[in-house]
């Protein structure tokens, strides 16, 4: 059900930190904001759900990482990559990116100055 979380590599690296956190609440939070009218997303019903559940857990998870621009950017890139295939059109991709870049601010963190969210070989 869950990944094996072992001590591999440099434990202070952003990659290690991003791997340790649960980014699903962040993904759900953003999808809810851009797809709130749709009935289902994944196996979870987001139609009647307050976004604050996901946001609280999302912010808690992002807070677990060192609050550096690079680590925050890597987390946002990972979220983008995870959700890329679910975004149906260009407009949705742009909406998702907009919400994603607002995420650190919603959690009262510093937003990364430069963060390239073009992932998955340019598809997103």
């Amino acid at each position: 059900m869950r990944r094996e979380r072992g001590r591999q590599g440099d434990s202070s690296s952003c990659e290690r930190q991003v791997d340790r956190v649960n980014l699903k609440p962040c993904e759900q939070h953003i999808m809810q904001r851009i797809m709130g009218e749709q009935e289902q997303y994944d196996s979870y019903d987001i139609r009647s759900t307050r976004s604050s559940d996901q946001q609280q857990r999302c912010c808690d998870e992002l807070n677990e990482m060192e609050n550096t621009q690079r680590c925050m950017c890597e987390a946002l890139q990972q979220i983008m990559e995870n959700q890329c295939d679910r975004l149906q059109d260009r407009q949705m991709v742009q909406q998702f990116k907009r919400e994603l870049m607002n995420l650190p601010q919603q959690c009262n963190f510093r937003a990364p100055q430069r963060c390239d969210l073009d992932v998955s070989g340019g598809r997103c």
Partner: antibody, heavy 123, light 108 residues
């Protein structure tokens, strides 16, 4: 074997203090959020407090806010609950519980529990 | 604070029967953050279901979970003697992470 063992319970007078501990073994303690949950005699479960992996985020139930302090020592694989200004209503079995999440879908759950330590607040 | 209300308080059934336990939230809860636990006398709680409908490791398929928003259900299709216990729902999306008051499933 994955295990949580609570200690530090006992009899204390109202207004007194007690420090509970939870020793973790069989897993990488620093990779998990941890919780304290209590159960008063003959009553249901009551979530008390949670602490994230790095201790950066901490939450408390309203009933214990300002009186209880949760902490952890990742180097020693231990979780603590400092309980001050104890009241009769704090009498309960206190469980330490590990919180994990499903990596593919995201939900959180408490999958490993200790057997509990009993706290009795009485004059 | 999200209040979870479980019903019925006590459910008296016989082995082989179907049990339906309800958990109602005072505010909408994401399925992602709804968990069910089982507790037997003198024992620590045991994880049963998470994400409202996913069975935990080792939980038999006679247990199933469903629901969304404010109404969630735990169903045991055919009761076995070892299923008689107290069942709790919990939401863990928004602090404080509240539990329902429990439903006691007893042998009729």
């Amino acid at each position: 074997e994955v295990q949580l063992v609570e200690s530090g319970g006992g009899l204390v007078k109202p207004g007194g203090s007690l420090r509970l501990s939870c020793a973790a073994s069989g897993f990488i303690f620093s990779d998990y959020n941890m919780n304290w949950v209590r159960q008063a005699p003959g009553k249901g479960l009551e979530w008390v407090s949670s602490i994230t992996r790095s201790s950066r985020t901490i939450y408390y139930a309203d009933s214990v806010k300002g009186r209880f302090t949760i902490s952890r020592d990742n180097a020693k694989n231990s979780l603590h609950l400092q309980m001050n200004s104890l009241r009769d209503a704090d009498t309960a079995v206190y469980y330490c519980a590990r919180e994990d999440f499903d990596v593919s879908t995201g939900p959180y759950y408490m999958d490993v529990w200790g057997n509990g330590t009993t706290v009795i607040v009485s004059s | 604070e999200i209040v979870l209300t479980q019903s019925p308080g006590t459910l008296s059934l016989s082995p082989g029967e179907r049990a339906t336990l309800s958990c109602r939230a005072s505010q909408s809860v994401s399925n992602m953050f709804l968990v069910w636990y089982q507790q037997k006398p003198g024992q620590a709680p045991r994880l049963l279901m998470y994400g409202a409908s996913t069975r935990a490791t080792g939980i038999p398929d006679r247990f199933s979970g469903s629901g969304s928003g404010t109404d969630f259900t735990l169903t045991i299709s055919r009761l076995e003697p070892e299923d008689f216990a107290v069942y709790y729902c919990q939401q863990n999306g928004n602090s404080p992470y509240t539990f329902g008051q429990g439903t006691k499933l007893e042998i009729k």
